[in-house]
């Protein structure tokens, strides 16, 4: 099943238009913005989701220290160029011919330049650090229960295999989820850690991308886990290239 046949919708992406015009009258869904056909049995790529979002009407100590090469998405939303597989193109440009290179999660990894800027390859983000702060609770969560529930969430909601959840760190009230996935580790059909992290980020913000599924109800031993702050760091297989001016 590419999509839910009964009412022809896309369970994994509500930013789609679906109709029974696939082979044999099967339900087929296309992403808003790009019009690309999407596989509704898995997560839609972040690039297509960002494109769809831009086309939609506007609404409003045990902890890991991110390395000096970690990127944070400070640029916010933009209308990306996606390749035929739905991945980010290595070079992105805006309407004023300002260009920059991005990694596989679409985060800028070079200084901005003009149309002459070259981005030879799409550099893979192989390590994502999701930094969360939860709202105060009666006591700290049990670390192993928290670890198990977060791995279960990524497995069952985002279909990310537990082997890609490298670690869950906890030092109340900070939770850090480390996702790791090298090019060599990612097999055909595996969900990309960048896509899983993006779905999780949108879920945490109360902006679920799933069709008809309830919002994220995270509980650890019945106790609600309510997140009040999220920060995501991205580490690429090749360190980013920024001028010293940006680093000071």
């Amino acid at each position: 099943h590419t999509a839910a046949q009964d009412n022809c919708t896309c369970p994994t992406n509500k930013m789609t238009v679906c109709s029974p015009d696939g082979p044999g009258g099967r339900c087929q869904c296309r992403a808003l913005g790009s019009g690309m056909a999407v596989d509704c049995s898995t997560l839609t790529s972040k690039c297509l989701l960002l494109k769809a979002r831009m086309s939609a009407p506007k609404n409003a100590r045990t902890l890991v220290r991110p390395s000096e090469h970690a990127l944070v998405d400070n640029d916010g939303l933009y209308d990306p160029d996606c390749d035929p597989e739905g991945r980010f193109k290595a070079r992105q440009c805006n309407q004023t011919s300002v260009c920059w290179c991005v990694n596989s999660v679409g985060v800028r990894r070079t200084d901005k330049g003009d149309l002459s800027l070259r981005c030879d390859e799409l550099v893979r983000t192989h390590h994502i650090l999701i930094d969360l702060r939860h709202r105060p609770t009666a006591g700290a969560f049990n670390h192993s229960d928290l670890d198990a529930e977060l791995r279960r969430l990524f497995r069952e909601r985002y279909r990310l295999h537990p082997k890609f959840v490298a670690a869950v760190h906890y030092e109340q009230p900070t939770i850090q989820i480390e996702l790791r996935q090298n090019t060599s580790q990612k097999a055909a059909g595996d969900v990309d850690i960048g896509d899983a992290a993006y779905y999780f980020e949108r879920d945490i913000k109360g902006e679920s991308l799933f069709q008809g599924r309830g919002g994220l109800d995270l509980r650890v031993r019945g106790e609600p886990l309510q997140v009040e702050r999220t920060l995501i760091y991205y580490l690429d297989e090749i360190p980013p290239k920024f001028s010293m001016k940006r680093l000071t």
Epitope: H1, P11, A148, R155, R159, P162, K163, V165
Partner: antibody, heavy 120, light 110 residues
Framework: QEQLKESGGGLVQPGGSLKLSCKAS????????VSWVRQAPGKGLEWIAY????????YYATWVNGRFTISSHNAQNTLYLQLNTLTAADTATYFC?????????????WGPGTLVTVSS | DVVMTQTASPVSAAVGGTVTIKCQAS??????LSWYQQKPGQPPKLLIY???KLASGVSSRFSGSGYGTEFTLTISGVECADAATYYC????????????FGGGSEVVVK
């Protein structure tokens, strides 16, 4: 050849305890999740617990209520199920079952089972 | 808690005929449904996963269909060796679950 083999079953008195083992061979234990499933004589399959050994993540059926504990010894490729406060209702064949290594919980490799009889 | 309900037993089938077993989930499990075959004195054997995909080494006489809450296992060209109990299982979640297996449906071949 990929195999699972349960052991440790037998006759136990009501209120007693027992520790079941499941030895895995022929595959990398850390790449899969494993469950314990039981079947009372003439009855259906009843899931007990699941563990992802690589990270020691454990999940239990709601009815377990702390009576049973799933664990693993990864270096020995062995899965365990500790059974406490046993009653006649726990009399069953206990199977260990491995998942397919995907994100689904479908079990494509099963052991032959070990029989636990709770009786005075 | 996802509860799985199966066709009542026993289900009779004639050799060469077709038999259908139904399974219902109390809430949507998308396509995350597996079917198992169990014969007396043996452990269960995985037949179908993700509602319609045939497990390795399983005869193509077995087929599965369904999505969401309604699922079906079909055995065509029934053989005497198909006499067994068949179980469906939701393969979506291990969280807050009483039992992911259905109650089982016994197939009797005449």
């Amino acid at each position: 050849q990929e195999q699972l083999k349960e052991s440790g079953g037998g006759l136990v008195q009501p209120g007693g305890s027992l520790k079941l083992s499941c030895k895995a061979s022929g595959f990398d234990f850390n790449k899969y999740g494993v469950s314990w499933v039981r079947q009372a004589p003439g009855k259906g399959l009843e899931w007990i617990a699941y563990i992802y050994p690589a990270f020691h993540n454990t999940y239990y059926a709601t009815w377990v209520n702390g009576r049973f504990t799933i664990s693993s010894h990864n270096a020995q490729n062995t899965l365990y199920l500790q059974l406490n406060t046993l009653t006649a209702a726990d009399t069953a064949t206990y199977f260990c079952a491995r998942d397919a290594g995907t994100t689904d919980y479908n079990f494509n490799l099963w052991g032959p089972g070990t029989l636990v009889t709770v009786s005075s | 808690d996802v509860v799985m309900t199966q066709t009542a037993s026993p289900v009779s089938a004639a050799v060469g005929g077709t038999v259908t077993i139904k399974c219902q989930a109390s809430q949507s499990i998308y396509s995350y449904l597996s079917w198992y075959q169990q014969k007396p004195g043996q452990p269960p054997k995985l037949l179908i996963y993700e509602a319609s995909k045939l497990a390795s080494g399983v005869s193509s006489r077995f087929s599965g269909s369904g999505y969401g809450t309604e699922f079906t296992l079909t055995i065509s060209g029934v053989e005497c060796a198909d006499a067994a109990t068949y179980y469906c299982q939701q393969a979506l979640t291990v969280g807050n679950v009483d039992n992911p297996f259905g109650g089982g449906s016994e197939v009797v071949v005449k």
